[in-house]
């Protein structure tokens, strides 16, 4: 599997899409997991509804949501209020019994908010009635890793 890079801005929402063969993955629930190290396990973050028929319903785990268009063949993951610690390697998975097929490997990169002037001391916090999510357009940039690029920095 090639790795696709999705870039998002800190504090904003990042939407990750994972296309798949809807015929092949018919009846199968999906999951989003985070890769722990280059050869480590993929730790489940969130999975689609326990009933495959209800996979279109958005499920949340903390600030991460998942929803599945089972006929169109697109799994969508939303990372809300993106933070630097969200950066890393993830997988979209299709669950088949006790097995999990990788649909896409995803590298999430978190960019600094260009409107963030914390250095200047003029921090802005949303008021209680304001939605932080609504203040920013959902946005993602994606690309495939070039040959030779590695998603994990080499460990010394």
């Amino acid at each position: 599997h090639n790795t696709t890079v999705f870039q998002g801005v800190a504090g904003q929402s990042l939407q990750v899409s994972c296309p798949y063969d809807s015929m092949k993955h018919w009846g199968r629930r999906k999951a989003w997991c985070r890769q722990l190290g280059e050869k480590g396990p993929c730790q489940r973050v969130v999975s689609t509804h326990n009933l495959w028929l209800l996979s279109f319903l958005r499920r949340w785990n903390g600030s991460t949501a998942i929803t599945d268009d089972t006929l169109g063949g697109t799994l969508t993951i939303t990372l809300r209020n993106l933070q630097p610690h969200d950066a890393g390697l993830y997988q979209c998975q299709s669950l088949h019994g006790s097995e999990a097929d990788t649909l896409r490997k995803v590298l999430v990169e978190v960019l600094a908010d260009p409107l963030d002037h914390r250095d200047a001391g003029d921090l802005w916090f949303p008021g209680e009635s304001e939605s932080f999510e609504d203040a920013h357009v959902e946005h993602s940039i994606s690309r495939s890793l070039l040959e030779g690029e590695i998603p994990f920095p080499p460990t010394s």
Partner: antibody, heavy 119, light 106 residues
Framework: QVQLQESGPGLVKPSGTLSLTCAVS?????????WSWVRQPPGKGLEWIGE???????NYNPSLKSRVTISVDKSKNQFSLKLSSVTAADTAVYYC????????????WGQGTTVTVSS | DIQMTQSPSSLSASVGDRVTITCQAS??????LNWYQQKPGKAPKLLIY???NLATGVPSRFSGSGSGTDFTFTISSLQPEDIATYYC????????FGGGTKVEIK
Amino acid sequence: QVQLQESGPGLVKPSGTLSLTCAVSGGSISDSAWWSWVRQPPGKGLEWIGEIYHDADTNYNPSLKSRVTISVDKSKNQFSLKLSSVTAADTAVYYCARDTKYWGGMDVWGQGTTVTVSS
Amino acid sequence: DIQMTQSPSSLSASVGDRVTITCQASQDISNYLNWYQQKPGKAPKLLIYDASNLATGVPSRFSGSGSGTDFTFTISSLQPEDIATYYCQQYVEAPTFGGGTKVEIK
């Protein structure tokens, strides 16, 4: 249009392995579809055995899973069924079929082949 | 496993009669249900897919309806060539068939 043809021994001994092949003609086994096996014991209803995708991904009937193996040979445009440790209860007409799920159901069937389990 | 309960198991009707067969799923299957016709000694033939869509080349006297757990298959005007056993089948999970309904002419 796509046609399917089952072949294999009509008689299998108890505790032996039933082996059948389904030849696909008029189309490619690499088409977007699941290739299925369904059986029908004499005078009874239809029972789904399992299915295979062209990339060799499989789904099996939970009640038969421990005894069933379905494989695909793309070079020969065919798929096969193996059912081990057979008993008289496995005597049935065995059908192969193409299943396009939401996009058209089990729309193509073979004519069926009778397999008898007897010593 | 999702169980499919079909009724009646057999029926006898006259040519021209309206014939109705029902199928009940043990859990919600949306519209992921097919209907097949099987004549003696022959392979099943797909008539209706996705609960209500007529398969290619199937006469319009055949129809299907329903969603969720309750489904109906109808022959609007029974013809002699419709003598067969009819099966419903769900495909949300591992496919399962109803027990069949044998249709005979009075």
